[in-house]
């Protein structure tokens, strides 16, 4: 009897949908695996007789529930199927946005870039998929614990009247208010302000 794949799960970030599993202990030799998806009531092969422990399902429709399954194989024997259900638009993790930061005197000027999507045109981003897409920004004075959060209305934001000659750190994430779903924070970007712009009298 061939044991089934273990710890079968979907790892999906920005619609890059990778079905992953672990190979079970099997004394007779090396196992191969076949992964399938349900399409119009028929299971279709996606990865056949692979020695890998993952299979890319990024070409699935972003909408709807998909039934995926994987089994282990050895010679002409095979395990039972292990099934999972996956809805990309609901289940995919929202990866960190890009961010450009520029210091202008005592201000930080930030521009945000929505994450790109696997199997899509360059210009079709997570913002196109989710109508309620917005950004959360948090910033703090480097070396302090107190963080401030803002929700920009646009793809850019300016933090004004900051302390001069002080390093501030900023990070951004995508947020979907209608789903109350937050994405992953970007890596902090830390920049030092320069002088303030007030002209001495």
């Amino acid at each position: 009897m061939v044991p089934p794949p273990e710890n079968v799960r979907m790892n999906s970030v920005n619609f890059k949908n990778i079905l992953q599993w672990e190979s079970p202990a099997f004394a007779k030799g090396n196992l191969t695996f076949t992964a399938q998806y349900l399409s119009y009531r028929i299971f279709q092969d996606k990865c056949m007789n692979t020695t890998l422990t993952e299979c890319d399902f990024s070409s699935l429709s972003k909408y709807g529930d998909h039934t995926l399954r994987v089994r282990a194989e050895f010679a002409d024997e095979h395990s039972d199927w292990v099934n999972i259900t996956f809805c990309p638009v609901d289940d995919t993790i929202i990866g960190p946005p890009g961010m450009q930061v520029e210091v202008l005197a005592d201000s930080l000027h930030m521009r945000f870039l929505a994450p790109k999507i696997e199997n899509e045109y360059e210009t079709w981003t997570m913002k196109n998929v989710y109508n309620s897409w917005t950004y959360n920004v948090q910033y703090w004075k480097n070396g302090t614990d107190e963080k401030f959060q803002i929700t920009p209305q646009y793809d850019f934001e300016v933090l004004r009247n900051l302390e001069p000659w002080t390093t501030y750190c900023v990070q951004v994430r995508g947020f979907l208010p209608d789903r109350n779903k937050a994405g992953e924070w970007s890596e902090p970007v830390c920049e030092q302000t320069t002088h303030d712009e007030t002209v001495p009298s």
Epitope: S59, L60, S61, K62, Y63, E120, T123, W124, N128, V129
Partner: nanobody, 124 residues
Framework: EVQLVESGGGLVQPGGSLRLSCAAS????????IGWFRQAPGKGLEGVSC????????HYAESVKGRFTISRDNSKNTLYLQMNSLRAEDTAVYYC?????????????????WGQGTQVTVSS
């Protein structure tokens, strides 16, 4: 059932232009996303361009950017693909497709309705 009907294909010389049209028979083309795909001889289906109804944004494959323009005329319920500076590698059957959910642009899996296609041949 919605039927999409493409027209405007034909034989054109390299460097020439064509305008493809797509109409929904007896229906409006009021879908969140509508787009163009193509299939060259012996090749798989390839996304060419799409237009999003929510913000009228247009999106293109790198291979056609700057040469092809997608547009829609809501009053005529018609989708267009203006193809300029055509090359031999643009030879394909071109399909119009519509998505009910509008979540995707390039992947054929995100589209629900398809036309029968119109042949475009670029040759001297």
């Amino acid at each position: 059932e919605v039927q999409l009907v493409e027209s405007g294909g034909g034989l054109v010389q390299p460097g020439g232009s064509l305008r493809l049209s797509c109409a929904a028979s007896g229906n409006s083309l009021d879908y969140p996303t509508i787009g163009w795909f193509r299939q060259a001889p012996g090749k798989g289906l390839e996304g060419v361009s799409c237009i999003s109804a929510s913000d009228a944004s247009t999106h293109y494959a790198e291979s056609v950017k700057g040469r092809f323009t997608i547009s829609r005329d809501n009053s005529k319920n018609t989708l267009y693909l203006q193809m300029n500076s055509l090359r031999a590698e643009d030879t394909a059957v071109y399909y119009c497709a519509a998505s009910l959910h509008g979540l995707g642009c390039k992947s054929e899996a995100d589209y629900d309705y398809w036309g029968q296609g119109t042949q475009v041949t670029v040759s001297s």
